[in-house]
Interface confidence: medium
């Protein structure tokens, strides 16, 4: 699986999850988030050669088409597969609020 | 929606579905498919600016991060959203077989 366990331990050029730290205030302008100050959102990148973690029959077809037509712009793309939520703390006036934001952290990638 | 109705009628530079005809024999080497000879598989391509058909909170976050850090390699990617099956005819010996291959035709795209 193209997950953090594999990708963070290997120098993988092809589609894999990569570490990316995002500071809420500096990188997003989300000044309301009190904690955490930032988090590892991660991202997916890298080429998708034929059959690499193909998501659908279409991505398999496109990967094969691309090997035979390497100059073509049509090729599968490395995108998130499994995502996890992130719990944030913010304040409404002086009242602390805890909220879970869904699909915030990429745990694995696929070729789609 | 970034679907064939919209994308095939407009000169859209950003993420959209694009027409792509694939000949089973010439482009994939699939000699076993008798009918059709080929089909419009289509594909997704184009930049994913902030909030363009964002698939998840993560793709929204990544798009926003990318507006402030345009040089960063971390950005959402234009990939298939809705796919449709394709019915094919092939032979096992002299016996014709009809099969529906799932997720073969891209009908719309998203930024993921």
């Amino acid at each position: 699986a193209l997950d953090t366990n594999y990708c963070f331990r290997n120098l993988e050029e092809n589609c894999c999850v990569r570490p990316l730290y995002i500071d809420f205030r500096q990188d997003l302008g989300w000044k309301w988030v009190h904690e955490p100050k930032g988090y590892y959102a991660n991202f997916c990148s890298g080429p998708c050669p034929y059959l690499r973690s193909a998501d659908t029959t279409h991505s398999t077809v496109l990967g094969l088409y691309n090997t035979l037509n390497p100059e073509a712009s049509a090729s599968p793309c490395c995108v998130p597969q499994d995502l996890e939520p992130l719990t944030i703390l913010y304040y409404v006036g002086r009242t602390p609020k805890v909220e879970q934001l869904s699909n915030m952290v990429v745990k694995s990638c696929k070729c789609s | 929606a970034l679907d064939t109705n919209y994308c095939f009628r407009n000169l859209e530079e950003n993420c959209c579905v694009r027409p792509l005809y694939i000949d089973f024999r010439q482009d994939l080497g699939w000699k076993w498919v008798h009918e059709p000879k080929g089909y419009y598989a289509n594909f997704c391509s184009g930049p994913c600016p902030y909030l363009r058909s964002a698939d998840t909170t993560h793709s929204t976050v990544l798009g926003l991060y990318n507006t402030l850090n345009p040089e960063a390699s971390a950005s959402p990617c234009c990939v298939p959203q809705d796919l449709e099956p394709l019915t094919i005819l092939y032979y096992v010996g002299r016996t014709p077989k009809v099969e529906q291959l799932s997720n073969m035709v891209v009908k719309s795209c998203k930024c993921s």
């Epitope: 990188d27 302008g29 989300w30 000044k31 309301w32 909220e99 | 926003l64 507006t67």
Partner: antibody, heavy 121, light 110 residues
Framework: QSLEESGGRLVTPGTPLTLTCTAS????????MSWVRQAPGKGLEWIGI??????STWYASWAKGRFTMSKTSTTVDLKITSPTTEDMATYFC?????????????????WGQGTLVTVSS | AYDMTQTPASVEVAVGGTVTIKCQAS??????LAWYQQTPGQRPKLLIY???DLASGVPSRFKGSGSGTEYTLTISGVECADAATYYC????????????FGGGTEVVVK
């Protein structure tokens, strides 16, 4: 504590113009500072913000490339890079309600009186 | 992104009456909302922050409420001095936005 804008005047289209917001009674390094404009008879239009401490800036999507914000210890500048007639408005600077990181999350409690920019050939 | 839609554009109210102004965000702003009052030729004045907290020196007849994407400013016991234009502003984020302010509501006091 007060804010005063200056630099507004009549300019010809395409002539760069810099507006200055001067703060009194507090340190700009501790507060988020924004520029907001208002065309005659129209609503409030946010241009951007410069954060206290880090000095990092955010601009409205329509304002990127058209405006540049910078600051010193006592002033915040807004440069209109190439004014058009669409930029004719009163320009206000505004301070976040609270000091420290994210202090503008509770709105802008201190505003200048505004400075008028007229663009005409 | 985080577009603010304010309604109505204009409202007429009698002295002593109650007026309600609504503000809708295109996505959740987690109570990150401020309200301002502006009279002609004057600078805006902060009335309410964090959706419901009254700014310093603001009379208690001004009340803010709401959460998520829907917010309301209510002025009860309206006085002549309340004739002004009122604006909402999302304060959740500065990133990737067009304008954090709503279009404004003109309150006319009869």
């Amino acid at each position: 504590q007060s804010l005063e804008e200056s630099g507004g005047r009549l300019v010809t289209p395409g002539t760069p113009l810099t507006l200055t917001c001067t703060a009194s009674g507090f340190s700009l390094s501790s507060y988020d500072m924004s520029w907001v404009r208002q065309a005659p008879g129209k609503g409030l239009e946010w241009i951007g913000i410069i954060y206290g401490g880090s000095g990092s800036t955010w601009y409205a999507s329509w304002a990127k490339g058209r405006f540049t914000m910078s600051k010193t210890s006592t002033t915040v500048d807004l440069k209109i890079t190439s004014p058009t007639t669409e930029d004719m408005a009163t320009y206000f600077c505004a301070r976040g309600r609270d000091g420290g990181a994210g202090g503008s999350r509770n709105g802008y409690s201190l505003w200048g009186q505004g400075t008028l920019v007229t663009v005409s050939s | 992104a985080y577009d603010m839609t304010q309604t109505p554009a204009s409202v007429e109210v009698a002295v002593g009456g109650t007026v309600t102004i609504k503000c809708q965000a295109s996505e959740s702003i987690y109570s990150g909302l401020a309200w301002y009052q502006q009279t002609p030729g004057q600078r805006p004045k902060l009335l309410i922050y964090a959706a419901s907290d009254l700014a310093s020196g603001v009379p208690s007849r001004f009340k803010g409420s709401g959460s998520g994407t829907e917010y309301t400013l209510t002025i009860s016991g309206v006085e002549c001095a309340d004739a002004a234009t009122y604006y909402c502003q999302q304060t959740w984020t500065d990133g990737g936005i067009d304008n954090p302010f709503g279009g404004g509501t003109e309150v006319v006091v009869k």
